[in-house]
Interface confidence: low
Amino acid sequence: KSPIFGPEEVNSVEGNSVSITCYYPPTSVNRHTRKYWCRQGARGGCITLISSEGYVSSKYAGRANLTNFPENGTFVVNIAQLSQDDSGRYKCGLGINSRGLSFDVSLEVSQGPGLLNDTKVYTVDLGRTVTINCPFKTENAQKRKSLYKQIGLYPVLVIDSSGYVNPNYTGRIRLDIQGTGQLLFSVVINQLRLSDAGQYLCQAGDDSNSNKKNADLQVLKPEPELVYEDLRGSVTFHCALGPEVANVAKFLCRQSSGENCDVVVNTLGKRAPAFEGRILLNPQDKDGSFSVVITGLRKEDAGRYLCGAHSDGQLQEGSPIQAWQLFVNEESTIPRSPTVVKGVAGSSVAVLCPYNRKESKSIKYWCLWEGAQNGRCPLLVDSEGWVKAQYEGRLSLLEEPGNGTFTVILNQLTSRDAGFYWCLTNGDTLWRTTVEIKIIEGEPNLKVPGNVTAVLGETLKVPCHFPCKFSSYEKYWCKWNNTGCQALPSQDEGPSKAFVNCDENSRLVSLTLNLVTRADEGWYWCGVKQGHFYGETAAVYVAVEERKAAGSRDVSLAKADAAPDEKVLDSGFREIENKAIQDPRLFAEEKAVADTRDQADGSRASVDSGSSEEQGGSSRHHHHHH
């Protein structure tokens, strides 16, 4: 499939101008190669009319130009003084005309309307309101006022001052007569439809002395704005329909066959299943404008999108709308990464998040997508040292491995952690990525005691048992804090006895705290990693209490509290409400090059690279061990 993209149809009127934008992947080869606009012949060839190398056909001399914008990956063809002869099939493309790196464009130039003298032209967008003004003379002030629409040869009555309304206009038309000083009546038509376009005649009086005024109503279907985004990337549709529909339900829909437009999301709570976990509809501003963000773009997301306002929350005739044509470029710079990560209850997951390598100093964020209302993504952790209260001790965002990838580790998993999570930064907005965490049955691989109590001034030894499958991995202990997990010295105590059917390669690695102080209280993690790529982790909370009896404590699996108390914290936490979406600076882009498919076996739980149609419930509350 060609990565070149442009408008499929361009319509204009004789004498007018058109501006046609074509998009291409902005690689250095593409930026510098020849750009062209050619007309397709009946026998299949394509005759160049204008190119970026300076060629201009005699047909276009003095009325056309082609401008390349390499930094945007676009070029624009402007054609003026259009005639009906310009109607036809064209291609905009790169390189050689016959090479296939092109996009087909149909140009339709129609004759301007043959208007009667003294015709007032009204040009109004679909779904909007028009006011047709009809002047009259004093002698017709008391006489019947009427508006007709010319249908074929005959005028058909639309509305009159005696109370008649044509059924096609019921509920959306009114006739206003100004004070006698004005000698003017007005017809206001709301929720304009394409079928409303045409020639109208307004009349005051019915005899030969009646006053007549011709009007031509043109109803414009919105030209779709072209949007060119990378596969696996992100798109934002900004929808501004005007303050007159501020209190009407809003929607975004995707056109399917014919005139059908399937709702993607609306403000009444509807959301298409295909967009679960990867869409947010931003709360509207006072003027009724809103935006919709879609992440993890797929091939099948390409197409025509409409946003609109209607009480039903879906497209109806007369809805004011805005339109976009989305092209998903499959030659994406965004690397493939897992869309589903599976973790065992009680264990952990490590998620690799891509970001723009050029923005290594950007702030990194991780948020939990919530489907309630119109979707939101409250932040859980950032790279500046903030962690949401419920996640203390079990969530960490690490800048490693760097160079376009950061890591998020979440441990002490429960079924409530199942759901969709977004990786983002305060830099480029096109690379927001989504991962679904699924909680599966199984046993954690690492074995640690439950909550542990240390005695002030004494020594504490905490064991972590690693099965043989991790024999080739680096094993570590660290102390969690809100900026990460600081590595601590640990001792290899030899093979572990905690595993059945496990050979000498299993390991018991202990953390020793000498002369325990109050500062030693907190969360400790043991885990495995390979270089800067992190695998499974297990967490232990160490409480510190006054001395009761002398001696050091050596905690075994059996002696520790196997099931620590779980306390659900209330929701009075710092929440950056919707910032993840309202503030575009909170979003990430760019090509992360770390290939997350080579994740450590078992250490990162199992990973699916395919997109998943299943959905996990979003987490609402999380447990914090004390």
């Epitope: 990565p3 250095s28 080869v29 499959e330 030659e331 690397p335 493939r336 090059v593 290939d595």
Partner: nanobody, 116 residues
């Protein structure tokens, strides 16, 4: 970081064929577009061919179109350049590049000499 090592160069008669290989080390090979460039003595390095990360699209310089074919095997972390109908003007050092459109990573090059 990606390291690239080219092989397959050599001396060949005009009209003959050669197949160049470029082996990449590093776990990120499949994320990159890959390309071949060449530099003849006293001339600037010039673009020859490129291939997208998934092999879905290829690009060629006009001078080699129809004679050279670029391909890749992501399982083997290798990109190939099959050169047929070689001409004396194809004589150059051929360089493999990862992320060629952004002038990313380069190999050391392999010499191709076409005698008439």
């Amino acid at each position: 970081q990606v390291q690239l090592v080219e092989s397959g160069g050599g001396l060949v008669q005009a009209g003959g064929s050669l197949r160049l290989s470029c082996a990449a080390s590093g776990r990120t090979f499949s994320s990159y577009a890959m390309g071949w460039f060449r530099q003849a003595p006293g001339k600037e390095r010039e673009f020859v061919a490129a291939i997208t990360w998934n092999g879905g699209t290829t690009y060629y310089a006009d001078s080699v179109k129809g004679r050279f074919t670029i391909s890749r095997d992501n399982a083997k972390n290798t990109v190939y350049l099959q050169m047929n109908s070689l001409k004396p003007e194809d004589t150059a050092v051929y360089y493999c590049a990862a992320d060629p459109f952004n002038q990313g990573y380069w190999g050391q090059g392999t010499q191709v000499t076409v005698s008439s």
